[in-house]
Interface confidence: low
């Protein structure tokens, strides 16, 4: 809390400019009008204020807007955003994607902070769903964003947004998340032809049921072992040796290296030894 003191004669700020960097903290508090600051927030980032001075500016905005800043101010916060707490941000109502982008830009290159997490949370809740433009923006700044969402929150992702998802965006997703995303991806890509469809759906297959894997095995897709190892064990177990051979194509030889790991291990134990022998890989059921 900065003590209230009268502004010295001739020091009253008429605009937000570089002269303010020479003001002491108490002078900023006394001489800068909060409403002026709010209307000229876009200038603050061009001025090399100290962290202590930024604290004073934040304090002035907090006093002017105790219920939370309006979006016109939020959009121009710039580096002052880094001074905000999650509790401050929870008071905001951010609806513009441009505002979101401006604030994410400030934090670019850093880990996702609790402040940014709260900002995104507020934005997505305000929109009601993760539309394609939002998802595009968020995954551009934070590739792991999708896998940070709970299955329940992922259910608000419309299938049309799935087109914005890149394979690396799903790297850290677990089975429960892929269970939600896979049906959406299947719907989104349903009109593509076989080989193009497989390229798009591949990253989501950790949520695929047995019947879909059986269907894929009829399409000469040549699934790689890395994708196969991420499949649901319960979806892989009912597949026959012939189906797995068709599904993997030339990659079937990789089963030997993975024979001790799930889902390969559990699948091997479900097969007849005669069938396994047809692969010529020395797999023991």
């Amino acid at each position: 809390e900065v003590e209230k003191t009268a502004c010295p004669s001739g020091k009253k700020a008429r605009e937000i400019d570089e002269s303010l960097i020479f003001y002491k903290k108490w002078e900023l508090e006394a001489c800068v009008d909060a409403a002026l600051l709010a209307t000229q927030m876009d200038r603050v980032n061009a001025i090399p204020f100290t962290y202590e001075q930024l604290d004073v500016l934040k304090h002035k905005l907090d006093e002017l807007y105790p219920q939370g800043y309006p979006e016109s101010v939020i959009q121009h916060l710039g580096y002052l955003f880094l001074k905000m707490s999650p509790e401050d941000i929870r008071k905001w109502n951010v609806t513009s994607l441009e505002t979101l982008k401006a604030l994410l830009e400030v934090n670019k290159g850093h880990e996702m902070s609790p402040q940014v997490a709260t900002l995104i949370d507020r934005f997505v809740k305000g929109r009601g769903q993760l539309d394609k433009d939002t998802l595009d923006t968020l995954t551009a700044f934070y590739p792991g964003y999708l896998c940070s969402l709970s299955p329940e929150e992922l259910s608000s992702v419309p299938p049309s947004s799935i087109w914005a998802v890149r394979p690396q965006d799903l790297d850290t997703c677990d089975p429960r998340q892929l269970d939600v995303l896979y049906p959406k991806a299947r719907l989104a890509f349903q009109n593509m032809n076989g080989s193009e469809y497989f390229v798009k759906i591949q990253s989501f297959l950790g949520g695929a049921p047995t019947e879909d894997l059986k269907a894929l095995s009829q399409q000469n897709v040549s699934m790689d072992l890395a994708t196969f190892m991420k499949l649901r064990t319960d979806a892989v177990l009912p597949l026959t040796v012939a189906e797995v051979q068709k599904l993997l194509g030339p990659h079937v030889e990789g089963l030997k290296a993975e024979e001790r790991h799930r889902p390969v291990r559990d699948w091997i134990l479900r097969q007849r030894q005669d069938d396994l022998d047809t692969l010529g890989l020395g797999l023991q059921g």
Epitope: P86, E87, E111, A117, T118, G144, C147, S150, E152
Partner: nanobody, 124 residues
Framework: QVQLQESGGGLVQPGGSLTLSCEAS????????KAWFRQAPGKEREFVAS????????AYADSVKGRFTVSRTYAKNTVYLQMNSLKPEDTAVYYC?????????????????WGQGTQVTVSS
């Protein structure tokens, strides 16, 4: 409903380490364990650490940064608090909290379910 069970508390000497764990059961698809708070005798409950759904986003109280680490299991139903370089002022009852939403947060109002707590005493 979500039930939370903390464990791992105890008596430890200054400079020592402890790992607390909190296992959740019940409706953990929506509400999952994601934070630790603590309450020392005669003081208010205070935030210690929080972790987001994906496990990569974390938040810590300044007083524990660099000493405590919050983590979670792959299945998302257990959250841990690894406490190193413990000090006498870390003595408190430690509570696990579960909430909805994916962001880590220090705001106790964001949590819907709380455990019974586990006592941590740091003393020589």
């Amino acid at each position: 409903q979500v039930q939370l069970q903390e464990s791992g508390g105890g008596l430890v000497q200054p400079g020592g380490s402890l790992t607390l764990s909190c296992e959740a059961s019940g409706h953990t698809d929506s509400y999952y364990p994601k934070a630790w708070f603590r309450q020392a005798p005669g003081k208010e409950r205070e935030f210690v650490a929080s972790i987001g759904w994906g496990g990569r986003m974390t938040a810590y109280a300044d007083s524990v940064k660099g000493r405590f680490t919050v983590s979670r299991t792959y299945a998302k139903n257990t959250v841990y608090l690894q406490m190193n370089s413990l000090k006498p002022e870390d003595t408190a009852v430690y509570y696990c909290a579960a909430g909805i939403g994916w962001a880590p947060t220090a705001d106790s109002g964001e949590y819907d379910y709380w455990g019974q707590g586990t006592q941590v005493t740091v003393s020589s």
